[in-house]
Interface confidence: medium
């Protein structure tokens, strides 16, 4: 028989983690494995048909993606949709596929909304999702004794698909669910310095444990301004939500693992400011299969897609598409063996959910709602040399924090700052006022 996989991803723009130039080679490698393994879909041929999720400008589009999906559905009647990755593109496609009872498999669509499976039935996310970031942050808060207050800041940049809005939404909602905690959130425009000033005025009254989603440059600017305003001392901690670790990469950007460094005359101050900073990223898989997969992926991307893949965490997305597709094919194989058909979307999807799988990204666990458990890393600066390194990892499957042995979290006080100042945010603690009065008497 024939099994058709309908791809709805950006076909021209290579900048997205889920661009076809990146995911295509991963799909090729997965299908090559299917061919090579007699236990996967014996006697079947798997073919891919392509539709673009981007508009004429190469930007993800909530119009182009569903139109492409509809065209592919009527023309090819696919057994499964692969993608989209962008939130606004994936939302209408996911609603259509739910209506058609066709499985949708993606390693993108990380926003909180896709976890609502009555709306996005048969949507499986084999990649990371933002609510899972909330699980990590909640575990971190419990471990470090921060169970009362946090502040989340997120940047808005025109044309960036509101990545930070969705990230903070997932984080905010999950942390509030997991902990009985007050969480404030503020938006700011990256290109408007007056917004930064407003944030700095608000910060002292809203939080000491602060999460910031922004570009690396905006985060550095905020840290420099915070230092100037005296907010970078031992009482504050700033977490940069830099999930793909852009700020930690070399090449054209900042020096490897020195996210404060720019060579612009402000490095000394920036390094000092970054003593109060930590960075949260996805965890880079460290299993040997992943490294081997990356070698093949890069080679194939260059040979067949004329695309040079850079190193970095962004490669976990094509790798997750690869693992997700193999998991789907495994589920189809089992469904057929039990007398089902490739069009039995519900049965196939149920076989993918609440299941573990050994993939190129390592041990992969899809939860009971069809979302992958996600691993994260926390990076911290060694004050002696200014370099950031992973100090602890979060295992999404076991939901445990795993300290990297022999490495320490750096706290200027020697221990984490309290999430609420000793006298409260507005000096409202009567005991503090009492002390103050007694010194005047």
């Amino acid at each position: 028989g024939n099994l058709t996989v309908a791809v709805v991803l950006p076909l021209a723009n290579t900048s997205y983690p889920w661009s076809w130039a990146r995911v295509g080679p991963a799909v090729e490698l997965a299908l090559a494995q299917v061919k090579a393994r007699p236990d996967l879909l014996p006697g079947w041929t798997v073919r891919t048909v392509l539709g673009s999720s981007e508009n004429a400008l190469g930007v993800c589009s909530d119009t182009a993606a569903p139109l492409a999906a509809v065209d592919l559905k009527w023309e090819h009647n696919p057994a499964v949709f692969l993608g989209p990755g962008c939130v606004y593109a994936a939302a209408p496609v996911g609603r259509f596929t739910a209506h058609w009872r066709v499985p949708l498999l993606t390693a993108g669509a990380p926003a909180l909304g896709f976890g609502v499976k009555d709306e996005y039935a048969l949507t499986t996310r084999a990649g990371p999702s933002y609510a899972k970031l909330g699980d990590f942050v909640a575990a971190l808060h419990r471990r470090l004794g921060w169970e009362r207050q946090a502040l989340m800041l997120y940047a808005y940049r025109p044309g960036d698909e509101e990545h930070c809005f969705f990230l903070v939404e997932g984080l905010f909602m999950r942390v509030r669910d997991r902990l009985n905690i007050t969480v404030d959130h503020l938006e700011f425009a990256e290109d408007d310095l007056s917004h930064y000033t407003r944030l700095l005025r608000t910060m002292p009254r809203k939080g000491r444990v602060i999460y910031i989603c922004s570009s690396p440059d905006a985060f550095r600017t905020l840290m420099l301004l915070a230092l100037e305003a005296g907010l970078c001392g031992e009482d504050y901690v700033f977490f940069h939500l830099d999930i793909f670790g852009q700020s930690l990469q070399g090449g054209q950007g900042p020096a490897p693992r020195r996210p404060w460094e720019r060579g612009d005359g402000q490095d000394v101050s920036a390094r000092q400011a970054f003593q109060a900073a930590k960075i949260i990223t996805y965890k880079d898989p460290d299993n040997p299969e992943y490294l081997e997969f990356l070698k093949q992926l890069k080679h194939l991307a260059y040979e067949q897609f004329n695309f040079t893949m850079e190193d970095g965490l962004v490669n976990t997305i094509p790798a997750s598409f690869h693992d997700g597709l193999l998991l789907y094919i495994q589920a189809v194989t089992e469904t057929l063996a039990h007398g089902g058909t490739v069009t039995d979307g519900e049965n196939i999807t149920q076989r993918m959910w609440n299941r573990s799988f050994q993939g190129v990204t390592g041990y992969l666990k899809i939860d009971s709602s069809g979302d992958r458990e996600t691993d994260f890393s926390l990076w911290d600066m060694d004050p002696e040399n200014g370099a950031f390194r992973v100090v602890l990892n979060y295992n999404g499957t076991s939901q445990e924090l795993v300290a990297v042995s022999g490495r320490k979290l750096n706290w200027p006080l020697g221990y984490p700052p309290p999430d609420i100042p000793k006298c409260g945010f507005d000096n409202e603690d009567p005991a503090c006022n009492q002390d103050h009065l007694s010194t005047l008497e």
Partner: antibody, heavy 124, light 107 residues
Framework: EVQLLESGGDLVQPGGSLRLSCAAS????????MIWVRQTPGKGLEWVSG????????DYADSVKGRFTTSRDNVKNAMYLQMNSLRTEDTAVYYC?????????????????WGQGTTVTVSS | DIQMTQSPSSVSASVGDRVTITCRAS??????LAWFQQKPGKAPKSLIY???SLQSGVPSKFSGSRSGIDFTLTISSLQPEDFATYYC?????????FGQGTKLEIK
Amino acid sequence: EVQLLESGGDLVQPGGSLRLSCAASGFTFSDYAMIWVRQTPGKGLEWVSGISGGGGSTDYADSVKGRFTTSRDNVKNAMYLQMNSLRTEDTAVYYCAREDQLPSYHNYYGMDVWGQGTTVTVSS
Amino acid sequence: DIQMTQSPSSVSASVGDRVTITCRASQGINNYLAWFQQKPGKAPKSLIYGASSLQSGVPSKFSGSRSGIDFTLTISSLQPEDFATYYCQQYNSYPYTFGQGTKLEIK
């Protein structure tokens, strides 16, 4: 009472193997990294290996890398040191110690609690 | 690896004396320095962590300080039970390393 108790030390021939155990009690075992340290007769202290609280991260001194393996069982509150291809220079008293990780309200205590040690002699 | 150079290797002192032992790291180790006391046939006992903080139950006659990569252990008034060997240890990063030890003997 917080306690660590090593066992498994013995006389063994060069090239042989031995497995040391460290039993912990009186504290939440999984909250602590665990360390093996050895002391050769009349000599100083040498860090041998460390394992994180969840067991997901281990590290070794160059002198034992590839020969020794540290593991832990957080259900049994125990840590182990599997020593293979033993050499005469591995002769020592082996101590296990705990080390706090991710402390909440204080600085890192370092290795605050040690066991009483178990003696390993490698000789033909 | 980070080298820890401890001095002196031995010191003779009398009961009631004040004794200072120093330790120098070959590179920066933040505040992650501990001091241990060891008596013959016994396990090391932690006295000080974080360069200057006393472990609980340790008498206040023991104190520690830091100046850059130089660390000091001071015992303010020696008692008979203080005669032992003292080690410094860095726990900034693996491999953890110890000083060679300072043997404190009764004069």
